[in-house]
């Protein structure tokens, strides 16, 4: 496979990763697929420094990240361990709130207007952030 050594056009480089910030909203699953088609993933926040970087770029706008509990436990889309990793939830979140009247609870995490995290209904059309790591071998399958 090939290695990505610089960020694509319209992406922002930071700490050996590339980030793309959407200008409009999609449901979480569509945002997730969008990033995958870019050979990327929804942003995985692993440190307070990365949190501040993303927060600076998105501003006070609800924005999806690559964290969900649609299959039970909370999971990062790239396999980063949730339990031992960085977290920045709002107080009393996540709460899997059922009172929204949209059916089910809240299974997808997003940055809120102050940057802290909340769980919400995955169908809500929020902005999103894609991330891909530089120097990472691509997922290109071997030639047969």
């Amino acid at each position: 496979g090939s290695e990505r050594t610089c960020c694509p056009v319209n992406w922002v480089e930071h700490e050996r990763s590339c980030y793309w910030f959407s200008r409009s909203g999609k449901a979480w699953a569509d945002a997730d697929n969008y990033c995958r088609l870019e050979d990327a993933h929804l942003v995985v926040v692993t440190s307070w420094e990365e949190q501040k970087f993303v927060q600076h770029h998105i501003g006070p706008v609800n924005t999806w990240m690559g964290l969900h509990d649609q299959n039970g436990p909370w999971k990062w889309v790239d396999g980063t361990d949730y339990e031992t990793g960085f977290k920045n939830w709002r107080p009393e979140q996540p709460d899997d709130w059922y009172g929204h009247g949209l059916g089910g609870g809240e299974d997808c995490a997003h940055f809120t207007d102050d940057g802290r995290w909340n769980d919400d209904v995955c169908q809500r059309p929020y902005r999103w952030v894609c991330e891909t790591e530089l120097d990472k071998a691509s997922q290109e399958p071997p030639l047969l």
Epitope: N10, W20, D30, Y34, R36, L37, D39, Q139, E140
Partner: antibody
Framework: EVQLLESGGGLVQPGGSLRLSCAAS????????MSWVRQAPGKGLEWVSV????????YYADSVKGRFTISRDNSKNTLYLQMNSLRAEDTAVYYC??????????????WGQGTMVTVSS | DIQMTQSPSSLSASVGDRVTITCRAS??????LNWYQLKPGKAPKLLIY???SLQSGVPSRFSGSGSGTDFTLTISSLQPEDFATYYC??????????FGQGTKVEIK
């Protein structure tokens, strides 16, 4: 000039197989997701499949899932669609198209002229 | 899946006419709407992306508008080369993109 050229279409019996190819030129092929879209005679356009630039992510329309396989060879700037268990309703002109993203938000900005697939006994 | 409904399915017009084609989505798709032109035996052409942005190289007589569920493609002054079939496409659902059924623009 940016160009896509499909080939591999033809007449095939129901249950048969066919492999379509799409040769790309004049753009950095491996950077872009690529898609197949078809148009049955007298019908509208139907999205069939898409593959990411590296080939690591693939998606299919429900109508072809489990029967069609999209793949790419970035060293040859070529996109493929392996079609198995073909049915009469798969008869269509098959177009390959380049997905432009970023500010375009999932538009298909370059298309080939298409190749005709006819499934008939 | 999101359903896209175009109207009319066909129309007859003369060179110089103003032509309007509408597209309605079965749910709110914000501005995730593209327009394409198809001619027999030719490669389809992207005209408008994100509802109102004109694709590079496309004549300015083509314009798009709308957001949410209702969208419009307008040709301000129809030219001989504009007789074709036009399709809208939603790109809100990634990647299960769906198209309208098409609008054929014929010579009156």
């Amino acid at each position: 000039e940016v160009q896509l050229l499909e080939s591999g279409g033809g007449l095939v019996q129901p249950g048969g197989s066919l492999r379509l190819s799409c040769a790309a030129s004049e753009f950095t092929f491996s950077t872009y997701a690529m898609s197949w879209v078809r148009q049955a005679p007298g019908k509208g356009l139907e999205w069939v499949s898409v593959i990411s630039g590296s080939g690591g992510s693939t998606y299919y329309a429900d109508s072809v899932k489990g029967r069609f396989t999209i793949s790419r060879d970035n060293s040859k700037n070529t996109l493929y669609l392996q079609m198995n268990s073909l049915r009469a309703e798969d008869t269509a002109v098959y177009y390959c198209a380049k997905r432009s993203s970023g500010w375009y938000e999932d538009a298909l900005d370059i298309w080939g002229q298409g190749t005709m697939v006819t499934v008939s006994s | 899946d999101i359903q896209m409904t175009q109207s009319p399915s066909s129309l007859s017009a003369s060179v110089g006419d103003r032509v309007t084609i509408t597209c309605r989505a079965s749910q709110n798709i914000s501005s995730y709407l593209n327009w394409y032109q198809l001619k027999p035996g030719k490669a389809p052409k992207l005209l408008i992306y994100t509802a109102s942005s004109l694709q590079s190289g496309v004549p300015s007589r083509f314009s798009g508008s709308g957001s949410g569920t209702d969208f419009t493609l307008t040709i301000s002054s129809l030219q001989p080369e504009d007789f074709a079939t036009y399709y809208c496409q939603q790109s809100y659902n990634t990647p299960t993109w769906t198209f309208g059924q098409g609008t054929k623009v014929e010579i009156k």
